[in-house]
């Protein structure tokens, strides 16, 4: 047995609409039936929670109703989408995966995905 490895892309550029998607993949040491995925944002030395979801293997991820995150799972991969991002949200987004059930518990923390967000330029006024 050893620590659970979590892999995620190093860099992602958000779309002009402020949407960023990335895959969080974990090497499951066992046959987990209940998994919890948390997205953390690190800025400077502060780490804050962006969103979290617990799901049963084979089922959809359920975030809180007003969460800025959505996601789908496929095997040991979780496809995460964060929306509503602005330039000030640029930072390192860390994927944390916990195998909650059955025991034993495993916790894996990725190295983070640097998400760059560029606010769109306002459209110039049209002169007719």
């Amino acid at each position: 047995c050893k620590a659970m490895h979590v892999a995620q892309p190093a860099v992602v550029l958000a779309s002009s609409r402020g949407i960023a998607s990335f895959v969080c993949e974990y090497a499951s040491p066992g046959k987990a039936t209940e998994v919890r995925v948390t997205v953390l944002r690190q800025a400077d030395s502060q780490v804050t929670e962006v969103c979290a979801a617990t799901y049963m293997m084979g089922n959809e991820l359920t975030f809180l109703d007003d969460s800025i995150c959505t996601g789908t799972s496929s095997g040991n991969q979780v496809n995460l989408t964060i929306q509503g991002l602005r330039a000030m949200d640029t930072g390192l987004y860390i994927c944390k995966v916990e195998l909650m059930y059955p025991p034993p518990y495993y916790l894996g923390i990725g190295n983070g995905t640097q998400i760059y967000v560029i606010d769109p330029e306002p459209c110039p006024d049209s002169d007719f």
Partner: antibody
Framework: EVQLVESGGGLVQPGGSLRLSCAAS????????MSWVRQAPGKGLELVAA????????YYPDTVKGRFTISRDNAKNSLYLQMNSLRAEDTAVYYC??????????WGQGTLVTVSS | ENVLTQSPATLSLSPGERATLSCSAS?????MHWYQQKPGQAPRLWIY???KLASGIPARFSGSGSRNDYTLTISSLEPEDFAVYYC???????????FGGGTKVEIK
């Protein structure tokens, strides 16, 4: 049954050093994050160090960073806390705690560290 | 740093009364854990994932809340419930958090 047994506490002078040990049994030690949590007399709980399962990553609050070092020996099912440059404010009961699915789910009985001249 | 503020610091109640303990987080978390500690003893996990009772915890205890505000409720206090209760985030990055300052439930 999960068991965590701390040892190594005692009286030490300011500026001195101490090494705490935690012997773990009853679970697969090398897959769990482990931590040290302290409690000063009459005060609340403070997380002072944590370490990932293979020992490659460690975490400290600013209050102890640079003075305390957490380590583990998975072959011996043991957790350690090396404390250097000790100060009076480090006086506390030090608990070894396992971080499991429901947070810190198992705790040792604690070992008292007293820093005084 | 996500600061947890527990209130009140002390709650003076009689056996049979209802106790409501609050924990407020400076930034949002999805789950909260609660620990009970009695004098001379190590803390013990009491409620996890906001509302789930740890093994052996009586049903008079309950937990609720979301995001920044969480509550531990004891419906009818028993003599053995008088202790200090601490909250700690059950999500986010656990090793960068501090415990709440604690609420002492004492006999009136």
């Amino acid at each position: 049954e999960v068991q965590l047994v701390e040892s190594g506490g005692g009286l030490v002078q300011p500026g001195g050093s101490l090494r705490l040990s935690c012997a773990a049994s009853g679970f697969t030690f090398n897959i769990y994050y482990m931590s040290w949590v302290r409690q000063a007399p009459g005060k609340g709980l403070e997380l002072v160090a944590a370490i990932n399962p293979d020992g490659g990553n460690t975490y400290y609050p600013d209050t102890v960073k640079g003075r305390f070092t957490i380590s583990r020996d998975n072959a011996k099912n043991s957790l350690y806390l090396q404390m250097n440059s000790l100060r009076a404010e480090d006086t506390a009961v030090y608990y070894c705690a396992r971080y499991g699915g429901p947070g810190f789910d198992s705790w040792g009985q604690g070992t008292l560290v007293t820093v005084s001249s | 740093e996500n600061v947890l503020t527990q209130s009140p610091a002390t709650l003076s109640l009689s056996p049979g009364e209802r106790a409501t303990l609050s924990c407020s987080a400076s930034s949002s978390v999805s789950y909260m854990h609660w620990y009970q500690q009695k004098p001379g003893q190590a803390p013990r996990l009491w409620i996890y994932d906001t509302s789930k009772l740890a093994s052996g915890i009586p049903a008079r205890f309950s937990g609720s809340g979301s995001r920044n505000d969480y509550t531990l409720t004891i419906s009818s206090l028993e003599p053995e419930d008088f202790a200090v209760y601490y909250c700690f985030p059950g999500s986010g990055f656990p090793f960068m958090y501090t415990f709440g300052g604690g609420t002492k439930v004492e006999i009136k």
